[in-house]
């Protein structure tokens, strides 16, 4: 009884998680032959989704300390009574701590919304930027490439830092940094296009810090289904932020009568969010939610971390699957609006476009669909996984695999439907994207399960690097290249403009099927890799510092 009181006091978490945490603590206590009363033993009472005893949950507005726990045989805390290092300290109120974690997750999700809002505000006013700076298409491509490349390069660096240093400080600094750069970029004179390119690169670095580290904090604040839910909220920020970015870009431009003002909105919100992160997000220890407390230390080198990740088959296959998602979303996002416009030209419901932007209406509809399907996909994926976990331990990768394979079918149908019905094509896009986006949060959750806490930031970073490198960094260009190649061997006509792009885009469903296969491969190794990660976590938490991971 003492244990459950302690767990609920610490967490205010879900009952099933408390029970699960209790079972794990009993098991670990038995393994170690730990003394102490009840289930708390040598571990202390870390409730589901919250730090173990002995952790100090710090915010700028104060800190909550709970009972320190020594290794077996050392004087620990009798029962689960939370003691403080100063006189008159009280047990924290359960609800406030639960609310605190909820607030932290909300702030982190808001930060992610802003990350994508900032990125897509630029996309929303890209034509204006091109017009103002006299940027050619290759220049616009350079802006995109510089952003992605700097993001890719910076991600592993922040992964390394995120596993070793204060994450919320890195997060806040990242937000402050990209906010300042974006704000400054709105004042770049027309002749300094290179400064605009540089600013996009710097924004990529700033945003990499966030995308890499924020999910790992959520991973350390919550466990099990609560973590899935919170990661779902966090990843829903991607379509929400993207959609809001387009809206912000165009509406602020119209309201102010000058596109420059569009780039001054997200930095202001960014500064506020960065400050809120510093104040409200607890400086969680790695492995908080895994009941590891102070005992879990990062003892491995970056090289060893990388070797361990590359040997982790579930991680490798899920990362390759994520690359397939990234490949498809990057290519479809760039080319589908133009493809649908060309379809309408063939159907004689639209004129041939000689002066860009071509397919502006289609871009808007596609953007709205992407935004909504992102939300629907994340919710569907999280819900399906929750339900499937009751049936199988391999639920996470299997749900992703089914989503991917189902998505491939509907992406194929886009090209069938577009020949005769634009509405039909949009329906296929809707279903296909919903299924494609259903694995966003689950993939992050898979990573949390199979990677130990001290490697999670590095793992997220490497996965981010891989998915960009093999995915959206090259897919838009590859599709364009294939389309041009097909067109060169055919006669110049609106029909072949439409067909050549359609044939090129058919590469996407094949890549998505490949991604589905990678998720099925993940399912093969998921249970064993998850068990190995749990075992390593248990070993790391044990007193001998010589444990090799």
């Amino acid at each position: 009884m003492m244990c459950l009181e302690c767990a609920s006091a610490a967490a205010g978490g879900a009952e099933e998680e408390e029970a699960d945490a209790e079972r794990r603590r009993r098991r670990r206590g038995a393994q170690r032959g730990a003394g102490g009363s009840g289930c708390c033993g040598a571990r202390g009472a870390g409730g589901a989704g919250v730090s173990a005893a002995g952790d100090e949950v710090q915010t700028l507005s104060g800190s909550v300390r709970r009972a320190p726990t020594g290794p077996p045989g050392t004087p620990g805390t009798p029962g689960c009574a939370a003691t403080a290092k100063g006189p008159g300290a009280q047990q924290p109120k359960p609800a406030s701590l639960g609310r605190g974690r909820g607030a932290a997750a909300a702030i982190l999700s808001l930060g992610n919304v802003l990350n994508y809002l900032d990125r897509y505000t630029v996309a929303g006013v890209l034509l204006d930027i091109q017009q103002h700076f006299g940027v050619k298409d290759r220049g616009a491509g350079l802006l995109q490439s510089v952003f992605i490349c700097s993001f890719m390069v910076a991600a592993p660096i922040f992964g390394y830092l995120g596993d070793r240093f204060n994450r919320k400080v890195i997060l806040s600094c990242g937000i402050f940094f990209w906010s300042a750069v974006t704000f400054s970029s709105s004042f770049i004179p027309q002749q300094y296009f290179w400064a605009l390119v540089l600013s996009r690169g710097l924004v990529g670095i700033g945003e990499a810090s966030y995308s890499t580290i924020a999910p790992t904090i959520i991973g350390d604040l919550f466990t099990k289904n609560t973590r899935t839910l919170m990661l779902s909220v966090f990843y829903f920020a991607i379509p929400l932020g993207s959609g809001l970015g387009y809206i912000t870009g165009s509406s602020v431009k119209q309201a102010a009568g000058d596109w420059h003002w569009a780039l001054r909105v997200s930095p202001v919100l960014g500064m506020i969010t960065g400050t809120l992160i510093l104040i409200l997000v607890p400086a969680t220890k790695r492995g908080h939610a895994d009941q590891l407390g102070d005992q879990l230390k990062a003892r491995t080198s970056w090289l060893r971390d990388m070797k361990a990740l590359i040997r982790n088959r579930s991680y490798v296959f899920s990362s390759l699957a994520t690359s397939a998602v990234s490949f498809a979303t990057g290519a479809l996002g760039m080319w589908i609006p133009l493809y649908l416009h060309r379809a309408q030209v063939v159907q004689k419901t639209a004129e041939t476009c000689n002066s860009p932007p071509c397919g502006a209406k289609d871009s808007l509809i596609f953007g709205a669909i992407t935004c909504f399907t992102g939300f629907l996909g994340v919710v569907t994926g999280a819900g399906a996984t929750r339900w499937c976990r009751l049936k199988t331990q391999r639920a996470d990768p299997l749900v992703c695999a089914v989503g991917m394979l189902g998505s491939a079918i509907f992406i194929c149908l886009i090209f069938v439907a577009a020949k005769s019905s634009i509405v039909g094509a949009y329906i296929c896009i809707f279903v296909g994207e919903t299924l494609l986006f259903s694995n966003w949060a689950i993939t992050a959750d898979i990573l949390m399960y199979v990677v130990i806490p001290t490697r999670r930031a590095t793992a997220v970073a490497l996965q981010s690097f891989t998915s960009h490198l093999l995915g959206d960094a090259g897919s838009p260009y590859l599709i364009g290249f294939i389309s041009d190649l097909i067109r060169q061997s055919t006669k110049d006509s609106p029909l072949w403009e439409f067909l050549s792009l359609g044939y090129a885009l058919m590469l996407c469903p094949f890549v998505v099927v490949l991604g589905g296969m990678f998720f099925l491969a993940t399912a093969l190794f998921f249970v064993s890799d998850r068990a190995r990660a749990e075992q390593q976590v248990n070993q790391l938490a044990m007193p001998p510092a010589s444990v090799k991971v």
Epitope: Q130, G134, V135, K136, R138, G139, Q191
Partner: antibody, heavy 125, light 107 residues
Framework: EVQLVETGGGLVRPGSSLKLSCATS????????MSWVRQAPGKGLEWVAL??????????NYAESIKGRFTISRDDSKSRVYLQMNTLRDQDTATYYC????????????????WGQGVMVTVSS | DIVLTQSPPTLSVTPGESVSLSCRAS??????IHWYQQRSNESPRLLIK???QSIAGIPSRFSGSGSGTDFILSINRVESEDFSVYYC?????????FGPGTKLEVK
């Protein structure tokens, strides 16, 4: 040496059409944005139309006063830029200059770094 | 459309004097202003780009300054070949527009 040579000017009646041509040499034409600028007798300079390069989808931009009547086009194989002028009016009487925009590969300046010698177009009944 | 106003319309100076020609924009245009010289019966030529950047082959006595809405073209010690019409042009936004010009004449 950069050279821009305009041809095709002359005396025409209001409502009629005329096509100006600008032959270029001394630079990579296909990568360069080109414009037409005009100057009415004894008056100031007025930008007429701009055509971007193929890397910008050969996008065209026009001054409000000639929109719908004039069309700018280019032929990269001949290194020529054209200005098709339809429904000409008295106020279109001017010297028409073919101009080049300075190119920086990834982007282009909107100012004119080279000008042709100009061609006179007179619209009169 | 951005309107450019040049002043004075005509400026009379003696050779060897230094002069400043003004160009004012109807709204802030950062440094997106360019200066051209047009001698009698000749095509215009670019003197200064982006408010202050010099152009190869243009004498160093020509310099530009300003940002936002107010811009200056300075000619240090005017020479006889400098007597011509000077135009400013904005490239901040389309349509591209020119100022009405300032005529520099011999006093």
């Amino acid at each position: 040496e950069v050279q821009l040579v305009e041809t095709g000017g002359g005396l025409v009646r209001p409502g009629s059409s005329l096509k100006l041509s600008c032959a270029t040499s001394g630079f990579t034409f296909s990568d360069t944005w080109m414009s037409w600028v005009r100057q009415a007798p004894g008056k100031g300079l007025e930008w007429v139309a701009l055509i971007k390069d193929k890397n910008s989808n050969s996008e065209a931009n026009y001054a409000e006063s000639i929109k719908g009547r004039f069309t700018i086009s280019r032929d990269d194989s001949k290194s020529r830029v054209y200005l098709q002028m339809n429904t000409l009016r008295d106020q279109d009487t001017a010297t028409y200059y073919c101009t080049r925009h300075e190119d920086f590969y990834y982007y282009s300046g909107y100012y004119f770094d080279y000008w042709g010698q100009g061609v006179m177009v007179t619209v009169s009944s | 459309d951005i309107v450019l106003t040049q002043s004075p319309p005509t400026l009379s100076v003696t050779p060897g004097e230094s002069v400043s020609l003004s160009c004012r924009a109807s709204q802030g245009i950062s440094t997106s202003i360019h200066w051209y010289q047009q001698r009698s019966n000749e095509s215009p030529r670019l003197l200064i780009k982006y408010a202050s950047q010099s152009i190869a082959g243009i004498p160093s006595r020509f310099s530009g300054s300003g940002s936002g809405t107010d811009f200056i073209l300075s000619i240090n010690r005017v020479e006889s070949e400098d007597f011509s019409v000077y135009y400013c042009q904005q490239t901040y936004s389309l349509p591209l527009t020119f100022g009405p010009g300032t005529k520099l004449e011999v006093k």
